[in-house]
């Protein structure tokens, strides 16, 4: 029986060219991790193995660095990053477990505190 | 000034599928996201998901996942719903609501979907 | 899924009366950064849901200031300080933090 749950950061809003720490946790269950999948949408970003240590896929090594801890950092962010991010965490014996955080990139002046919304 | 114009309303049978459109003006589409959302008849409203016009990418919560499709059609800044193999549990008004920072500041008039043989 | 309850269920007021609305959540709403999305609708009858407050305490454009919004954490309010005869319909609070959003089950303000 999976008792596990997972706490994520919550959803991002942050500002173009910034950078944010994605992070998940997963408490509740005496399983073990043996590995940590980060996704978006369908595009893999990055694993991290219980024996094997990190891979950043290619096509995000300028972007993406591994930690802190399972977690991991955006960094330069573009309006494309906007999207929603799974953390996949493979366990045994329970099986997968899986987070959502949504990053939304604003333009500067309306990221976080600054957001107004009447700017059209 | 901002506006979200919803097609009309829907009276369609068991078991068919139907799409809605949102055609949004007076702002920049793709620098917002755009949320659905569910009203059953003197229910509660619950979230459906949102749609990023920007790149096309979705978040659906899971209890619309396989009932409900969101897509955007840039080029005309129109969004739209299309709602699968329709139950009378689907009969409902639904609404489509501008979204940033996490929170819905413009919605569209609502469009009434009822699904009956 | 988060869940948010919203008290009371149906609240009966007097035009000029002063009245609260709480929204709790099952998890706390503040994400890492510090930053909570909890934001307040007025649903009235035959109109679309409109927006009220939005990030705990801010009013959105054209929201008069009889509106105010507090709390954090898993605890928040939306205070009307005098209430008027367009005041009346569905409040509901809606949780963005975590996916899926989630709303409040609402509550009807009405006339005593």
């Known amino acids: 029986m999976m008792t596990g749950t997972i706490e994520t950061t919550g959803n991002i809003s942050a500002e173009k060219g910034g950078s944010i720490i994605l992070q998940c946790h997963l408490s509740s269950t005496t399983a073990q991790v043996t590995q940590v999948n980060w996704e978006q949408q369908d595009q893999l970003l990055a694993i991290c193995n219980a024996d094997l240590g990190w891979h950043i896929s290619p096509s995000f090594k300028d972007r993406v660095a591994p930690g802190p801890g399972l977690g991991l950092t955006l960094q330069s962010l573009t309006v494309n990053d906007t999207g929603e991010y799974f953390c996949i965490y493979h366990t045994y014996p329970d099986g997968t477990y899986t987070g959502r955080i949504f990053l939304e990139v604003l333009e500067s002046s309306v990221a976080e505190h600054g957001a107004r919304f009447q700017i059209p | 000034e901002v506006q979200l114009q919803q097609s009309g309303p829907e009276l369609v049978k068991p078991g068919a599928s139907m799409k809605i459109s949102c055609k949004a003006s007076?702002?920049?589409?793709?620098?917002?996201?755009m949320s659905w959302v569910k009203q059953s008849h003197g229910k509660n409203l619950e979230w459906i998901g949102l749609?990023?016009?920007?790149?096309?990418?979705?978040s659906y919560s899971q209890k619309f996942k396989g009932k409900a499709t969101l897509t955007v059609d840039k080029s005309s800044t129109t969004a739209y719903m299309e709602l699968l193999s329709l139950t009378s549990e689907d009969s409902a008004v639904y609404y489509c609501?501008?979204?940033?920072?996490?929170?819905?500041?413009?919605w569209g008039q609502g469009t009434s979907v009822t699904v009956s043989s | 899924d988060v869940v948010v309850t919203q008290t009371p269920l149906s609240l009966p007021v007097s035009f000029g009366d002063q009245v609260s609305i709480s929204c709790r959540s099952s998890q706390s709403l503040a994400n890492s950064y510090g930053n909570t999305y909890l934001s307040w609708y007025l649903h009235k009858p035959g109109q679309s849901p409109q927006l009220l407050i939005y990030g705990i305490s801010n009013r959105f454009s054209g929201v008069p200031d009889r509106f105010s919004g507090s709390g954090s954490g898993t605890d928040f309010t939306l205070k009307i300080s005098t209430i008027k005869p367009e005041d009346l319909g569905m409040y509901y609070c809606l949780q963005g933090t975590h996916q899926p959003w989630t709303f409040g089950g609402g509550t009807k303000l009405e006339i005593k």
């Open positions: 749609i990023i016009p920007y790149t096309g990418g979705t």
């Open positions: 609501a501008r979204s940033r920072t996490f929170a819905m500041d413009y």
């Open positions: 007076g702002y920049s589409f793709t620098g917002y996201t």
